[in-house]
Interface confidence: medium
């Protein structure tokens, strides 16, 4: 129903706390360089204005759209052009073009320093002094680094953060209480960020239809007892929620997500038997819980998929008269039978089925032509299954760090033109798939591995889009979203690449590396490894292992030495010489 004042409506629906949090996220995602204080001031002004509209919906400007109100606020920021360059040109446009312009200027890789966590005592002091400001800082810092973070989910992570601090700041050993818990939240939030970015990419590049297909497959796997009408309704609603969040309409997105959670909890009987635990929780926890609820038990008496989609004499009629609906039914039926497949794989199978019908229904004897379609799925299914087996075996053999290094070598050979920091970030993220997925039961591995890899590769594509340097990467990133992972997997050594000349300074290290945290040390070593591969793209695994072992031993020796600086300055050049010889 239409409301006289959109801002009053959203304030009333969401409540002040969530309203303020979402406005802060929205501003931080649009203008990523502004300080917390600048954004906090704008948020307060918007909130005060919303309250005047709640009191009187007919008050001046209360009838304006949220885009108009927020855009006007952002465009009134002093020194916008100095700080943001051409983003300031957006302010010369009218809505809806102005909002589209802001969206196009979101930066997936802003040049901001890493978000450093203060030490426990300092954190607890500032949290106790002003919990609201502390959480505001958290929302601001995460949102500006992740401009497509799913806003209602970020409120959930802030709530988690709040609960952890409340608990741990009361402990004697704050540090050992906080560190593992906050590390856990950070890891989950980072995965949530790349997953959501993938959804927004799907929406931006391929439209709502592509996202809805993803949602149908995912929901059918999770709720195999829900019928197609129910799945379609949920997929339509979920598409709307994601479209709003990806489009910067965060208040509408959070409000509609709450509505969807409410609907699911009121209709558990027709959706799933597994929802009750989630539905007993408060709003943010409820919606988060529903988004990762375990799969319902599959109905025992599902007929073979062939009955409806291969053996039936009306297949071509069904397809011709309502293509999308018929293919949607196929995707639903196949997905509910295969919780053990990745969504990407299910979408590839649906695409193959569609292509087969397109071809066969134009022929003289369609049933004879499409009769073998299910058998033709086999290679499409085997490929990711083999990928999972090979990679999980390798992970189990090498551990996470060794597995990351193997991936780093592989991907540097596939796309040596890509910048080393991007390759290292991608390999570290891709390598985490082992820890995340390979320890799961067999039937959960494939969906976990492939859908996670797809999300990470989406980030690789986004970063590469900014400065395209590799034809291999461009080729894989230009195709459909579901074909990306197989495309990257199939890439081999880039034969067109002219090896980088050997620069001694790239492999020169100083004693400051000894005091770095383990993660930073690993990144330094992995940077050197990528550079080695760029110098010798066809180096064998043995050669690279020799060099890296030598390198690790060198660091270990010099970091234990009494005079570290001397050790680094004398042993360093020897290491460089040995490296060159080993790779010659």
């Amino acid at each position: 129903e239409a409301h006289k004042s959109e801002i009053a409506h959203r304030y009333n629906d969401l409540g002040e706390q969530h309203f303020k949090g979402l406005v802060l996220i929205a501003f931080s995602q649009y203008l990523q360089k502004c300080s917390y204080d600048e954004h906090a001031k704008l948020v307060q002004e918007v909130t005060d204005f919303a309250k005047t509209c709640v009191a009187d919906e007919s008050a001046a400007n209360c009838d304006k759209s949220l885009h108009t109100l927020f855009g006007d606020k952002l465009c009134a920021i002093p020194n916008l052009r100095e700080n943001y360059g051409e983003l300031a040109d957006c302010c010369t446009k009218q809505e809806p073009e102005r909002n589209e312009c802001f969206l196009q200027h979101k930066d997936d890789n802003p040049s901001l320093p890493p978000f450093e966590r203060p030490e426990a005592e300092a954190m607890c002091t500032s949290f106790k002094e002003n919990p609201t400001t502390f959480m505001g800082h958290y929302l601001h810092e995460v949102a500006r680094r992740h401009p497509y973070f799913y806003a209602p989910e970020l409120l959930y992570y802030a709530e988690q953060y709040n609960e952890i601090l409340t608990q741990c700041c009361a402990e004697a050993d704050k540090e050992s209480c906080l560190t593992p818990k906050l590390d856990g939240v950070k890891e989950k939030a980072l995965v949530s960020s790349v997953r959501q970015r993938m959804k927004c990419s799907s929406m931006q590049k391929f439209g709502e239809r592509a996202f809805k297909a993803w949602a149908v497959a995912r929901l059918s796997q999770t709720f195999p007892n829900a019928d197609f009408a129910e799945i379609t309704k949920l997929a339509t609603d979920l598409t709307k929620v994601n479209k709003e969040c990806c489009h910067g309409d965060l208040l509408e997105c959070a409000d509609d997500r709450a509505e969807l959670a409410k609907y699911m909890c009121e209709n558990q009987a027709t959706i799933s038997s597994k929802l009750q635990t989630c539905c007993d929780k408060p709003l943010l926890k409820k919606a988060h819980c529903l988004s990762e609820v375990e799969h319902d038990t599959m109905p025992a008496d599902l007929p073979a998929i062939a009955a409806d989609f291969v053996e039936d004499q009306e297949v071509c009629k069904n397809y011709a008269e309502a293509k999308d609906v018929f293919l949607g039914t196929f995707l639903y039926e196949y997905s509910r039978r295969h919780p053990d497949y990745s969504v990407s794989l299910l979408l590839r199978l649906a695409k193959k089925y569609e292509a087969t019908l397109e071809k066969c229904c134009a022929e003289a004897n369609p049933p004879a032509c499409y009769g073998t379609v299910l058998a033709e799925f086999q290679p499409l299914v085997e490929e990711p299954k083999n990928l999972v087996k090979t990679n999980c075996d390798l992970y189990e053999k090498l551990g996470e760090y060794g597995f990351q290094n193997a991936i780093l070598v592989r991907y540097t050979q596939k796309a040596p033109q890509v910048s080393t920091p991007t390759l290292v970030e991608a390999a570290r993220n891709l390598g985490r798939v082992g820890t995340k997925c390979c320890t799961l039961p067999e039937d959960q591995r494939l969906p976990c591995v492939e859908d996670y890899l797809s999300a990470i590769l989406n980030r690789v594509c986004l970063l590469h889009e900014k400065t395209p340097v590799s034809e291999h990467v461009t080729k894989c990133c230009s195709g459909s979203l579901v074909e990306r992972r197989p495309c990257f997997s199939a890439l081999t050594v880039d034969e067109t690449y002219v090896p980088k000349e050997f620069k001694a300074e790239t492999f020169t290290f100083h004693s400051d590396i000894c005091t770095l945290p383990e993660k930073e040390k690993q990144i330094k070593k992995q940077t050197a490894l990528a550079e080695l591969v760029k110098h010798k793209p066809k180096a064998t695994a043995e050669q690279l292992k020799t060099v890296m072992d030598d390198f690790a031993q060198f660091l270990d020796t010099c970091c234990k030495a009494a005079d570290k600086d001397t050790c680094f300055s004398t042993e360093g050049p020897n290491l460089v010489t040995r490296c060159k010889d080993a790779l010659a």
Epitope: A229, D308, D312, K317, A322, V325
Partner: nanobody, 126 residues
Framework: EVQLLESGGGLVQPGGSLRLSCAAS????????VAWFRQAPGKGREFVAG????????YYADSVKGRFTISRDNSKNTLYLQMNSLRPEDTAVYYC???????????????????WGQGTLVTVSS
């Protein structure tokens, strides 16, 4: 759950007409693929006509094409079968079956319809 209740059967002379109704409850009929089947004494259930859920695609058995018309009234949540030019071989108990959440009839196989009415008898005889 979908409950179905057929009505409209009876005795009719060859060449005559009848209109069968199937009232549905527990689910909107336009969200459900529904079909009419019939069962003559000593025989299996045979597909007669069907209509898709969400999309009005209709299907007929060859033996009834041009004589029978399937339709539905969403406001009344009811399915109909208009039977004209009836023949003695049309004599049977007529059942309606539903496949909830099916946007299309994609099968003429009775086993794939989980919900059924109790049936209504149609006798064509002079």
């Amino acid at each position: 759950e979908v409950q179905l209740l057929e009505s409209g059967g009876g005795l009719v002379q060859p060449g005559g007409s009848l209109r069968l109704s199937c009232a549905a409850s527990g689910r909107y009929i336009d969200e459900t693929a529904v079909a009419w089947f019939r069962q003559a004494p000593g025989k299996g259930r045979e597909f007669v006509a069907g209509i898709g859920g969400g999309v009005d695609i209709t299907y007929y058995a060859d033996s009834v094409k041009g004589r029978f018309t399937i339709s539905r009234d969403n406001s009344k949540n009811t399915l109909y079968l208009q039977m004209n030019s009836l023949r003695p071989e049309d004599t049977a108990v007529y059942y309606c079956g539903a496949r909830p959440g099916r946007p299309l009839i994609t099968s003429k196989v009775a086993d794939l319809y989980p919900y059924w009415g109790q049936g209504t008898l149609v006798t064509v005889s002079s």
